[in-house]
Interface confidence: low
């Protein structure tokens, strides 16, 4: 007698978007409202991701890959997936405990998230100041006396700098 | 005998909003899912949303997201579809229907349908 | 412009076999075992002919049967009668975010 037949687990054949059900005999059965599933063979759907309050819905859930969320307008995403969100402050700004606070004479923000950037300081370059540095916007640093000369780049512009991991709004 | 009887037909006007309700009767209501399809003049189906009539769960075409709202009431054994911002274009047969058993594939009973005209 | 699409009309005389397609995608038709198939006489409600792709329910003639290939799953309707004159819809389970599809639907004459 035949003992070659496939002992293959009956699920394996359900495509993303189902489940297989237990309660009907192992069938699949397609995954329900607000639950996904975004690989085969899984014996339950995941529940979707609902972006509520500060989160707004970026791409809807599907029944095989799960909601994605950002903010509202006034906020800016943190974390992985856009786990967290946070509160916007105006250019010249950062967050803290208390909320959003001016940056400090000497540093700037150019951006609506992040903390205030001390200002470049042009004399370690040999280099001197030719605009003044703002809350919102770094110094420009100019050339030095030994940079007059025919030819040279009369304005070099500090490199910008920027947090790891953002993008300027 | 399953039944799912429906709403009297509704005219309304551009903006307003309409409610339509499906009420159940002939098993039991919690264990079947409930769709709505809706159907303009002349032309074929639409599928609207689910409701589990259990957990209240739903889930919205993406057409319709944010203008349709799906609820049930268990002790009516009714569930209700409101349609919000209505246009000319939702003029149409509004059907409830039966998941066959529980998130099954298809609808094995329908209602009778109920004609919401949108006229100014 | 329907998820699935379907011949607008087919017909045939009584006794001859018809079948209606219903082609869709790998997200739908192609992607689940969960096509339907709906009868609606004018001024009617739609009426379950044929689920997850080849079951009938209990009720319906045997004279109805389903079947699929790839994207595209199809209605057969064997020795047709006059009362078989009416619209039929496909409609499939999507792995999009709206989970259900229809067919355009196709108005089938009985000669």
């Known amino acids: 007698f035949e003992r070659t037949r496939s002992l293959q687990d009956p699920c394996s054949n359900c495509p993303a978007g189902t489940f297989c059900d237990n309660n009907r005999n192992q069938i699949c059965s397609p995954c329900p409202p607000n639950s996904f599933s975004s690989a085969g063979g899984q014996r339950t759907c995941d529940i979707c991701r609902q972006c509520k309050g500060v989160f707004r819905t970026r791409k809807e859930c599907s029944s095989t890959s799960n909601a994605e969320c950002d903010c509202t307008p006034g906020f800016h995403c943190l974390g992985a997936g856009c786990s967290m969100c946070e509160q916007d402050c105006k250019q010249g700004q950062e967050l803290t405990k208390k909320g959003c606070k001016d940056c400090c004479f000497g540093t700037f923000n150019d951006q609506k998230r992040g903390i205030c950037r001390p200002w470049t300081n042009c004399s370690l370059d040999g280099k001197s100041v030719l605009v003044n540095g703002t809350k919102e916007r770094d110094v420009v640093c100019g050339p030095s006396p030994a940079d007059l000369s025919p030819g040279a780049s009369s304005v070099t512009p500090p490199a910008p700098a920027r947090e790891p991991g953002h993008s300027p709004q | 005998e399953v039944q799912l009887v429906q709403s009297g037909a509704e005219v309304k006007k551009p903006g307003a909003s309409v409610k339509v309700s499906c009420k159940a009767s002939?098993?039991?209501?919690?264990?079947?899912?409930t769709h709505w399809v809706r159907q303009a003049p002349g032309q074929g189906l639409e599928w609207m949303g689910i409701i589990n009539p259990s957990g209240g769960s739903t889930s919205y075409a993406q057409k319709f997201q944010g203008r349709v709202t799906m609820t049930r009431d268990t002790s009516t054994s009714t569930v209700y579809m409101e349609l919000s911002s209505l246009r000319s274009e939702d003029t149409a047969v509004y059907y409830c229907?039966?998941?066959?058993?529980?998130?099954?594939?298809?609808?094995?009973?329908w209602g009778q349908g109920t004609m919401v005209t949108v006229s100014s | 412009q329907s998820a699935l699409t379907q011949p607008a009309s087919v017909s045939g005389s009584p006794g001859q076999s018809i079948t209606i397609s219903c082609t869709g995608t790998?997200?739908?038709?192609?992607?689940?075992?969960?096509v339907s198939w709906y009868q609606q006489h004018p001024g009617k409600a739609p009426k379950l002919m044929i689920y997850d792709v080849s079951n009938r329910p209990s009720g319906v003639s045997n004279r109805f049967s389903g079947s699929k290939s790839g994207n595209t799953a199809s209605l057969t309707i064997s020795g047709l009668q006059a009362e078989d004159e009416a619209d039929y819809y496909c409609?499939?389970?999507?792995?999009?975010?709206?989970?259900?599809?229809f067919g355009g639907g196709t108005k089938l004459t009985v000669l």
């Open positions: 409609s499939s389970y999507t792995s999009s975010s709206t989970r259900w599809v």
């Open positions: 002939g098993y039991t209501f919690t264990s079947y899912y």
């Open positions: 229907a039966r998941g066959a058993p529980e998130y099954s594939s298809s609808s094995d009973y």
């Open positions: 790998s997200s739908d038709v192609g992607g689940y075992n969960y």
